[in-house]
Structure formats: structure tokens, C-alpha cells
Amino acid sequence: EEELQVIQPDKSVSVAAGESAILHCTVTSLIPVGPIQWFRGAGPARELIYNQKEGHFPRVTTVSESTKRENMDFSISISNITPADAGTYYCVKFRKGSPDTEFKSGAGTELSVRAKPSAPVVSGPAARATPQHTVSFTCESHGFSPRDITLKWFKNGNELSDFQTNVDPVGESVSYSIHSTAKVVLTREDVHSQVICEVAHVTLQGDPLRGTANLSETIRVPPTLEVTQQPVRAENQVNVTCQVRKFYPQRLQLTWLENGNVSRTETASTVTENKDGTYNWMSWLLVNVSAHRDDVKLTCQVEHDGQPAVSKSHDLKVSAHPKEQGSNTAAENTGSNERNIYGGSG
């Protein structure tokens, strides 16, 4: 009888993660008596995957009827494949003895595992930035195999070109990770904008994965201020408004100053939203000019999103208005309905 040969017909097998891998092996003879074993890798550090003789291998099943001696098919199925299972598998015939001795090995079957990348996670800068500044976004995806992968960046559907991408590790590995950093120039219209990281991989069958970041989390559009004096509403009363326009985010505190002294502080509440996602707000001040002997410098001071305050002033001329006898400064008039300065917002 011819000497036993161990035949592994497949040089390589590719399996999607989570599926089962079938590794084929047949022998050409019933002798010598002794077990078949499967190993991953070669040499002294090889890992035992299945031993016909003994042991518990919950993920491994024999493909053929192993209770018949005439069976020469020692193919195995490994369930629930993960990237960690990748490697070269050897079917090895042993001769019975004490110890069992390796008689002949198959040529090996390389198992590669196709693993999907994780959903891309896009993260922006830790602090907000203002228009005209360049900010960096990172995109990460992990656990994919094989190594080949394509990553693209988009801003509102327009592909970006200023980015750098790395796939790690550089050498052979059971699975890989991708890390990319894109640079984006902010504009005032970016409150509604999105940055998208798109990952394409063989396992995704042409349906790429996307991760998004809203620029609303990143951008700060500082407000523009305009202080105007409205026509006199009543004798000796002037309405002064502070228009706070085109700001984002909404977090804003406004303080009125009268000749440098705090008159009133309020927080933006009933704002109006512009089409571009920025906000407008208006605060008004009703000034009783008869309470003032001299001109009044009214300042609208705005602190937006924790940034240093910006302000706009308006000089209110009182010389043209006749003064009431016995009148005092605004600070000295305390009558509840006789306030010299009234305020409101809208």
C-alpha cells in the first residue's frame, strides 16, 4: 500500500467574520493507525485547534461521518469566525504511540477573515472656533480585515482634499484600524453644515459606512451689535434698542450700561432664528431723559458663549429736552412706577 499522504486542497480560504470556515483535509491511506490533529501555525508554538483523539473543541465539528474507519475525510468546520482566527491551518496525521509521533502534515490552508469596519466615529475640536479659522476633525474605524480600505471626507456633500489617513498596524495583523484627520475652514454659514467621514471596504458590498459631525457643535459665530435710538414714545422718554444679530450658539448675556454703570442684565431667551441657523435678538431700553442733566452714554455690552464681551455705545443727547424741577438722577429715583430707565427685549 502506498504511503499515506495528507491532502489539503485549498491553499487559502476567505470567510466573513461571524460565519463558519470549512477547512478541507483528506488522507490517502488508513495506515498508520493514529489520530488526526489540526493546528494553526507551524513549529513549536503552533496552536492545537482540533484533536481527533481527545479534548474539548466547542467551535470545531468534523464535516464527515467520523465514526466510520473507511472515512478518510478529516475536514473540519470552525464556527463563529473572528479576525483572531486568521492564520495558516495544518492537518497533521500522527502515528499512535507513546508519545504519538507526527507522521505527515498537509501543506496548510491560509484562513483570511473578512471583518467589517466599525461605524466611523467623527470627533471635532474640544473648543469652538470662529469663521475663517481652520479646525481639525478626526475619524476612526476599527476591527476590519483585510487591510485595504478607502476613506473620504465630505462637507455638505462636497469632497474634501485636505486630510491625512493612517491604517495601523503597518505589518500583518488579524485586524486593522484607520485614523484620519481632516482640516476644515469654517464660514459664517456653517451652523447647519455637516462633516462626513465615509469608509468603503470589501465587506460592505458597495454600501459605505458614514460617520458625521455637525459643525453646530464646533462653530461660534460672534454677534454684530447695533444700537439705535427710536423716536420719542412720550414726553421726555427715549427708546433705545440693541440689535444683536447673526450669533451662534444661543448662549448670550446682555448688559446695559448707563455712563459706565450697570443698568440691567438679561439673558437671551426669545430669540429668532435665521435661515442659516444663526440667531437674532433685540433688547430695548426706555430712558427718561428728564432725569438727566447731562448727555448719557448708553452701552450695550454682550458676552457671547463665554467669550470676552463686545459692546456698542450710543450717546443720548439730553440738552435738547427741558429738565423738570427737582428731578434727580436715575439712580436716586426709586419710585416703583416712576423708574427713569425701563427695559425690555424681544
Epitope: 500500500e1 488508513l30 495506515i31 493507525v33 493514529g34 489520530p35 488526526i36 481527533q52 483523539k53 481527545e54 467520523s66 465514526t67 466510520k68 474507519r69 473507511e70 472515512n71 499512535k96 504511540g97 507513546s98 508519545p99 504519538d100
Partner: antibody
Framework: EVQLVESGGGLVQPGGSLRLSCAAS????????MHWVRQATGKGLEWVSA???????YYTGSVKGRFTISRENAKNSLYLQMNSLRASDTAVYYC????????????WGQGTMVTVSS | DIQMTQSPSSLSASVGDRVTITCRAS??????LAWFQQKPGKAPKSLIY???SLHSGVPSKFSGSGSGTDFTLTISSLQPEDFATYYC?????????FGQGTKLEIK
């Protein structure tokens, strides 16, 4: 059903011959190592002989040169030709199938009695 | 030849008992050790192979262990049908050899 049935036992005089047969059913006998095991009355088990799938044969020391194991694939049968029989060969002879990959005994026949006596 | 020594030669036990029979080989036999059960007037029945693997249909109350030269057969809870003679056997190399047997009797 996997089964082994021995036949051919009986009473024989010392120095005589006897041929034991074992008919296999439910499996292909030629694919397995096959064995003969004997047991003298009130004694333990003793392995006697084996034939491998390649036709290689093995014997215990006390029967070497006197016993011959063989098989006939067409009849799916195993044989033990016993010559120069001695009183010490008196025993029940069992036909046994070796296991799938390690030759561990798995299937036993019911046995046939061989008595060597004058 | 490899000698197989069983102990004890006989053993008395009661229904429900847990019993252990040992078998020692005169040299290393890896784990190519089998256990058989034989009742009077019957052919032996294969219980265990490769020291610890149960043959098909053998109840799990039978268990085997060991490797090298020292082996044990344990019956976890004796039932009336378990009273019989038990044999160990090495089958690592020819000539295959059996232990002398352990007769398990009802106390």
C-alpha cells in the same frame, strides 16, 4: 446494525487444527483492524492476534507460528486458523473490531468455544 | 510486553456507592487505555477508550482518567446492573495486554 458472529469452535484433540470464522455485518471489515481475543474459563481476557487494513498481522508470543489470522473481503469475514493446538488454547474466542482511528476495541462478537482435550 | 496491573482484584460495594478501580502500566502508554465490563457468560462490553472517552451508549456514571502509567475507572453511583468484572487494556503497541480484572460484587 454493526455485528460480529463467530463460528467454527468445538472439541479438538491436542495437536489438531481448527478454523474459526467471524462474519461481519453493518460495516466493511477490510477498513478496520480486526482482532481475536480469548478467555479461558474463569480467567481473564487475553489478546491473541490482529490483522491491519494493509494485511499486516500480529500475534501474541504463545501462538506465533501456530495460528494464522486472515480475512476474505468478498465475504466480509475474518478467520483464525489454529494448528498444533494445545490444552492451554482452550478458551472462548472472541472476534473484535478495532476502533476508527486508534484501534480501541469497540464491537465484540458473542464468542465461540474451543476445547482442546484428548 | 507491557504488563497491566489492576487493583483491587475484587471489591464489595453497595448500590449507590461510588467506586474506583485503578490500573497501572509497566511503561508509559500515553492514554491508549481502554476499560471493559463483562458479566458472567457474556462477551465483554467496551466502556471507555483513550483513558477517558466514553463509547457510544455508555452512561455518564462511568468515567475514566489518567495518562502515562496510572489510570482509574470510576462508577459514580452503583446500580444492580453494574456488578460485574472490569478489565483495563493497553493498546498502544502489540501485543495488546489486559489487566487481570477486578470483580465488583454486591456487599
Amino acid at each position: 446494525e454493526v455485528q460480529l458472529v463467530e463460528s467454527g469452535g468445538g472439541l479438538v484433540q491436542p495437536g489438531g487444527s481448527l478454523r474459526l470464522s467471524c462474519a461481519a455485518s453493518g460495516f466493511t471489515l477490510s477498513s478496520y483492524d480486526m482482532h481475536w481475543v480469548r478467555q479461558a474459563t474463569g480467567k481473564g481476557l487475553e489478546w491473541v492476534s490482529a490483522i491491519g487494513t494493509a494485511g499486516d498481522t500480529y500475534y501474541t508470543g504463545s501462538v506465533k507460528g501456530r495460528f494464522t489470522i486472515s480475512r476474505e473481503n468478498a465475504k466480509n469475514s475474518l478467520y483464525l486458523q489454529m494448528n498444533s493446538l494445545r490444552a492451554s488454547d482452550t478458551a472462548v474466542y472472541y472476534c473484535v473490531r478495532g476502533g476508527v482511528w486508534d484501534d480501541a476495541f469497540d464491537i465484540w462478537g458473542q464468542g465461540t468455544m474451543v476445547t482442546v482435550s484428548s | 510486553d507491557i504488563q497491566m496491573t489492576q487493583s483491587p482484584s475484587s471489591l464489595s460495594a453497595s448500590v449507590g456507592d461510588r467506586v474506583t478501580i485503578t490500573c497501572r502500566a509497566s511503561q508509559d502508554i500515553n492514554n491508549y487505555l481502554a476499560w471493559f465490563q463483562q458479566k458472567p457468560g457474556k462477551a465483554p462490553k467496551s466502556l471507555i477508550y483513550t483513558a477517558s472517552s466514553l463509547h457510544s451508549g455508555v452512561p455518564s456514571k462511568f468515567s475514566g482518567s489518567g495518562s502515562g502509567t496510572d489510570f482509574t475507572l470510576t462508577i459514580s453511583s452503583l446500580q444492580p446492573e453494574d456488578f460485574a468484572t472490569y478489565y483495563c487494556q493497553q493498546y498502544v503497541s502489540y501485543p495488546y495486554t489486559f489487566g487481570q480484572g477486578t470483580k465488583l460484587e454486591i456487599k
